[in-house]
Amino acid sequence: KRFHDVLGNERPSAYMREHNQLNGWSSDENDWNEKLYPVWKRGDMRWKNSWKGGRVQAVLTSDSPALVGSNITFAVNLIFPRCQKEDANGNIVYEKNCRNEAGLSADPYVYNWTAWSEDSDGENGTGQSHHNVFPDGKPFPHHPGWRRWNFIYVFHTLGQYFQKLGRCSVRVSVNTANVTLGPQLMEVTVYRRHGRAYVPIAQVKDVYVVTDQIPVFVTMFQKNDRNSSDETFLKDLPIMFDVLIHDPSHFLNYSTINYKWSFGDNTGLFVSTNHTVNHTYVLNGTFSLNLTVKAAAPGPCPPPPPPPRPSKPTPSLATTLKSYDSNTPGPAGDNPLELSRIPDENCQINRYGHFQATITIVEGILEVNIIQMTDVLMPVPWPESSLIDFVVTCQGSIPTEVCTIISDPTCEITQNTVCSPVDVDEMCLLTVRRTFNGSGTYCVNLTLGDDTSLALTSTLISVPDRDPASPLRMAN
């Protein structure tokens, strides 16, 4: 059998195989050692007994989408049946005091591979044996502690495979420079040691995407905005836009990145090299936000120019080459033939990313201030608690609710939270009455809210002992 017979249904065309060559990967036309690595079809009854105590689930994830030319990393994590885990030696053991359907196990091991490898014979002086090989016959790499690695992972995509020895989780990175744009399929088959052979325990597949567009996300934050995920924001308060470029392999680390913003409110284009920008909308309504990100990224070099006729040099040719290749020298003397390509040149290509959002701007509570605090006189004898009125002003829209959070002087340990609807006139002046149990210093967070906004103010308040002569003080 060949690898492609074992690993996948998807057969890429000859063109795809030729043009999607992955560095360090092998062609799936290679032979598969079915004696050491038996192949079971889906639904084969043997899968049921491939693992003691249930089925192992493999979870395959990737940091897709990947900008073409960058590295994409795949991670496989094995999830064992309940109460099972991998120990420091790579053996599979039962978790202590964990009860599964079979109850508590007397034997601490599910698989004691250390014992198997110690019993193993047929080793030569290098510790290599005929069974410590991958499905294509290549020997296992002898990293320190390789004997504790008891799972064999075979990755398969684009007509090629990659084999890896590992523990219950492995990672593989692939450079995408030669990968066709668009969605691709990665399939992984996992085997476990079984004496001097291997048993399949899991298969998993996942789609990954290679793109020539920079993957761009924008987070938006605005003070007093009640719900940052609904793309509704408040008039007259700055919104902070933060651009996140999905570049987990740091492919663009040395690129100059430009951000071109259009906020949709006739304020024109704003170009910046900073990934954050603030913008304030001064009108209510719906606006179309557009962002274009441009980065000069390492990319394919242009095809060599046809040999020019021996006439006057062509300045545009030099310019063309320079636009791709910062290392290309200008013409030397008057001989255009000296523009020949330099080996191992670093060519650059402009990559773009786009983000578009429709944002709604509405009125909101812009500011809230406590302008006065009054101790409410209570009938004698003085009770344990104090009543305090906070006179509060606000700017912007009319609040509909008030919340007070009373906490310790560090403002960290909440003692009491009270929210209630409020009726406020157009002047936005209201009095909030709250009870304080006993004297001392309190942190008071007071928020005024409406449908779209939540404005906060804080103060430290010193509540005196219940002596009519003691004044109420703002601690700050």
Partner: antibody
Amino acid sequence: EVQLLESGGGLVQPGGSLRLSCAASGFTFSNYAMSWVRQAPGKGLEWVSSISHSGGSKYYADSVKGRFTISRDNSKNTLYLQMNSLRAEDTAVYYCARKWSTFDYWGQGTLVTVSS
Amino acid sequence: QSVLTQPPSASGTPGQRVTISCSGSSSNIGNNYVSWYQQLPGTAPKLLIYDTPLRPSGVPDRFSGSKSGTSASLAISGLRSEDEADYYCGAWDSSLNAYVFGGDTKLTVL
């Protein structure tokens, strides 16, 4: 002068529906939260529901949650209470009131009778 | 069973001072304003006291409100026959997220 005028009450069978309206005048309706309060015959006052000035926040008594819906049309200065799945215990005079942290103005009420 | 507790009845002779109590908890009276409502027979309720102890315009100063901890009270001095009515206390309850009333207190002027 602030005026609140309820309408839409009447006799309805259990399980039936009714929509009450409250026409407001004498104040800037869109600046105020509004509420419905009811009073069963010979009984005390029971708050039913409240709505913020813009209509974005709504509160309901547990006894009517999921059956009644409060709404408002600020362009018409009108408050509504849509009552579905009515029960005999919903029989009451329904008052429309201004504000929601206190009720400073009340309408004269409209009688809703739920009976077969 | 009302969340706020009021006596079912109160009485007094003309000119006398009468007090009606209203008892609740920290989630209503303790941390929110208390209002008092008067309902004359056959009419809609009317706001007497709000944001303890404020009075809307048109309400005589014979009516006053006070609050101590989780209890509130309405005092009527110089009692008159036209004060004979049902009286209700009310407050927002922050735990229930609901406005709560006391059971009515029937005031009789003897």
